[in-house]
């Protein structure tokens, strides 16, 4: 089971969790894991417990302080060691340098809100949760509109190529209803991801007034 | 990617001591890792041991712990298999590769072409 294909993948949200996802075939699904991270210039170091998200994949977020406060930087270099029990000794599995500000994922963008919803058009706000102050208006974002009878996968995507957090959704259907998510990257980064998906915001345009033209 | 040249393989005795170097050429290995694999004949291939780019970290397979010594020159870019009291069952095929972190598996994403090493008893 050890020279099957593994995957140790982690993600630094900008400000104080590493998200981690650690897969191997042919692992037993009960095996204890965890990650322990190790940074190169801190005093501080935390440990994470794997749990099982599929078949042969574990999951965890090693929570390195409050969510807001900056617990890392660009110069910063975390090891990361996989680390599975063994009858009674913790064996190391995998070791990785992790550099945080190059493999960025973001939280998912919050506080979506409808600003003013016409016939045809609806201007919309977010916000975006737990992002260091270091990428000061370098972000990007990607949004999407589901209209009925269709499916996310098939919404277009709109790309807003600046700290824009707000869009005004044109070209809509009177009274009919809509949803809306957003997602945030930030343009620093090799191996920078885009957050995922905020929560569907469902709004609803305003019905055509009686005996105008539509 | 990353193109490795491994060397310093050769014939020697058992007990007897052997450094294999691995260069790597082609972009920064930066916070990559380097691992060596190796293959003995009709046997699948076999981690032997790994070394984070940045930190310096290691890993080694148990068969080989306490008597191989990974390490690294980041000004010359490159890496190296201290081997030790070795063994003929050490025979094999050793292969550097690079990934963005080190295992103990045999998936790598870049690797050098090998260099055979043969303990005679």
């Known amino acids: 089971a050890v020279n099957g294909t593994s995957q140790f993948t982690c993600f630094y949200n900008s400000r104080a969790n590493i998200s981690c996802v650690w897969s191997q075939d042919g692992a037993l699904q009960d095996t204890s894991c965890q990650v322990h991270a190790w940074p190169d210039r801190r005093r501080w170091n935390q440990t994470c417990e794997l749990l099982p998200v599929s078949q042969a994949s574990w999951a965890c977020n090693l929570i390195l302080g409050a969510p807001d406060s900056q617990k890392l930087t660009t110069v910063d270099i975390v090891t990361l060691r996989v680390l599975c029990r063994e009858g009674v000794r913790w064996r190391v599995m995998a070791i990785q340098d992790f550099k945080p500000f190059e493999n960025l994922r973001l939280m998912a963008p919050i506080s979506l809100q409808v600003v003013h919803v016409e016939t045809h058009r609806c201007n919309i706000s977010w916000e975006i949760s737990q992002a260091s102050h270091y990428f000061e208006r370098h972000l990007e974002f990607e949004a999407r509109t589901l209209s009925p009878g269709h499916t996310w996968e098939e919404a277009p995507l709109l790309t807003l190529k600046q700290k824009q957090e707000w869009i005004c959704l044109e070209t809509l259907t009177p009274d009919t209803q809509y949803e809306f998510q957003v997602r945030v990257k930030p343009l620093q980064g090799e191996f920078t991801t885009w957050s995922p998906w905020s929560q569907p915001l469902a709004f609803r345009t305003k019905p055509a007034a009686l005996g105008k033209d539509t | 990617q990353v193109q490795l040249v491994e060397s310093g393989g050769g014939l020697v005795q058992a007990g007897d001591s052997l450094r294999l170097s691995c260069a790597a050429s082609?972009?920064?290995?930066?916070?990559?890792?380097m691992g060596w694999v190796r293959q003995a004949p009709g046997k699948e291939r076999e981690f032997v041991a790994g070394?984070?780019?940045?930190?310096?970290?290691?890993l080694y397979a148990d068969s080989v712990e306490g008597r191989f010594t990974i390490s690294k020159d980041n000004a010359k870019n490159t890496g190296y298999l201290q081997m030790s009291s070795l063994k003929p069952e050490d025979t094999a095929v050793y292969y550097c590769?690079?990934?963005?972190?080190?295992?103990?598996?045999?998936?790598?994403?870049?690797w050098g072409r090998g260099t055979q090493v043969t303990v005679s008893s």
């Open positions: 590769a690079v990934d963005r972190y080190c295992y103990r598996g045999t998936v790598y994403r870049d």
């Open positions: 082609g972009r920064s290995l930066s916070t990559d890792c």
């Open positions: 070394i984070t780019w940045g930190t310096g970290s290691t």
